[in-house]
């Protein structure tokens, strides 16, 4: 029930989760200098029942040097088998999170984890794409893939998301241009390191637009 | 508890505006797209458009295109839609509804959500009449 | 804009029964289908989301399958409150669109 593969890779794009289905298994990762605790567990696991799903296990790191210091981070990538990336950022609000039913949330940080979460993901899981900052997304279809399973294998979808600068034209037919960056504000900084899974409604081609007017607006 | 909470009934006559709003509550605000969509007496759901409240990007049904305006407050969670030029045709319970997204940048120029319209708001009677 | 036909307008059942819903949506939508519940005088309920999920706190005997164009909702045994009308919703292609509603009633 595992996914052979990763996520297919989008040029100028990023993917991410927004929840995990049962049977999803995250690695325990810590960042250079700190390793999995010996007692702890390689990964934590997406289990739920008919209600409720949690992660089963705590990843937990301890310094390299100091043995004894024990640290409630990320296990250590060298253990790692297939490394599954998410391509996300540890650091993401949980309150903006949805609770799915069969579904984990992503997990909170745990101190000095790997920068990167290596996921494991099981068929049926969805990730969902965003073009990276700098550039736009051609509206052509969902802009996320679905791990299914065809014919005995596992594949994913591919998603219909095409990103281009932003001095390239990249409108529906009859949307404007803004102006200027909304509310006059600086693009996120932490928006270039995450990836957040924007789930738009997609268009799978321009032409079904015709009598559809986009209108991007900033008060 | 998470909830969306809507302005009460309106009369109005033809050619006259009328502002609906929709106060959200119990959960992260930027992190919802909110769908306004009006259900006209015995007939079915009609969507008129979507606002990211995270810049108040929006976008338009073509039908109600020039007519409607959505804007949002942050600082109120409230968002609201203003309809102009009515005539008796827009008698309708008007809702807003909440969608997840993910683009939450102001510079964001995506405008992806999925899950469902999983919270509405009570609905908001506008009647226009002569 | 993707038109999407739900069938039959009105279904007549007694509890107990399966209801079978049908929405049939003019071009593809992959499994981009919700389905919604609204009963008189209420807002609609989401029920089903990506064609066969449930929604948080959703009972079992709603279910839901299709992918493409042809779209299904089954409640496999009707209980008094189930008796409402539902709406199928499409989010693959801007704009939104919804059907014209089934009502199941009471027969």
């Known amino acids: 029930e595992l996914c052979d593969d990763d996520p297919p890779k989008i040029t100028h794009a990023t993917f991410k989760a927004v929840a995990y289905k049962e049977g999803t298994m995250l690695n325990c990762e810590c960042k250079r200098g700190f390793r999995r605790i010996k007692s702890g567990s390689p990964y934590m696991l997406c289990t739920g029942n008919s209600s409720h799903s949690s992660w089963d296990n705590q990843c937990q790191c301890t310094s390299s040097a100091a043995r004894n210091t024990t640290k409630q981070v990320t296990p250590q990538p060298e253990e790692q088998k297939e490394r599954k990336t998410t391509e996300m950022q540890s650091q993401m609000q949980l309150a903006d999170q949805v609770s799915l039913p069969g579904h984990c949330r992503e997990p909170p940080p745990w101190e000095n984890e790997a920068t990167e979460r290596i996921y494991h993901f099981v068929v049926g899981q969805t990730v969902y794409y965003q073009c990276v900052q700098g550039y736009r997304a051609l509206h052509r279809g969902p802009a996320e893939s679905v791990c299914k399973m065809t014919h005995g294998k596992t594949r994913w979808t591919q998603p219909q998301l095409i990103c281009t600068g932003e001095t390239e034209p990249s409108q529906f037919p009859g949307e404007e241009e803004p102006q200027a960056s909304p509310d006059g504000l600086p693009e996120s900084e932490t928006s270039r390191l995450v990836t957040t899974t924007d789930f738009r409604i997609q268009t799978e081609v321009a032409a079904t637009m015709e009598t559809f007017i986009f209108t991007t607006e900033y008060q | 508890q998470v909830q969306l909470v809507q302005s009460g009934a309106e009369v109005k006559k033809p050619g006259a505006s009328v502002k609906v709003s929709c106060k959200a509550s119990g959960y992260t605000f930027n992190s919802y797209y909110i769908h306004w969509v009006r259900q006209a007496p015995g007939q079915g759901l009609e969507w008129l458009g979507i606002i990211n409240p995270t810049g108040g990007r929006t976008i338009y049904a073509q039908k109600f295109q020039g007519r409607v305006t959505m804007t949002r407050d942050t600082s109120t969670t409230t968002v609201d839609m203003e309809l102009s030029s009515l005539r008796s045709e827009d008698t309708a319970v008007y809702y807003c509804a909440r969608v997840p997204g993910y683009c939450k940048d102001t510079s964001c120029q995506d405008f992806y959500y999925y899950y469902g319209m999983d919270v509405w708001g009570q609905g908001s009677t506008v009647t226009v009449s002569s | 804009e993707i038109v999407l036909t739900q069938s039959p307008a009105t279904l007549s059942l007694s509890p107990g029964e399966r209801a079978t819903l049908s929405c049939r949506a003019s071009?593809?939508?992959?499994?981009?289908l919700a389905w919604y519940q609204q009963k008189p005088g209420q807002a609609p309920r989401l029920l089903i989301y990506?064609?066969?999920n449930r929604a948080t706190g959703i009972p079992a005997r709603f279910s839901g399958s299709g992918s493409g164009t042809d779209f299904t909702l089954t409640i496999s045994s009707l209980e008094p409150e189930d008796f409402a009308v539902y709406y199928c919703q499409q989010r693959s292609n801007w704009p939104p669109t919804f059907g014209q509603g089934t009502k199941v009633e009471i027969k």
């Open positions: 071009q593809s939508v992959s499994s981009y």
């Open positions: 990506d064609a066969s």
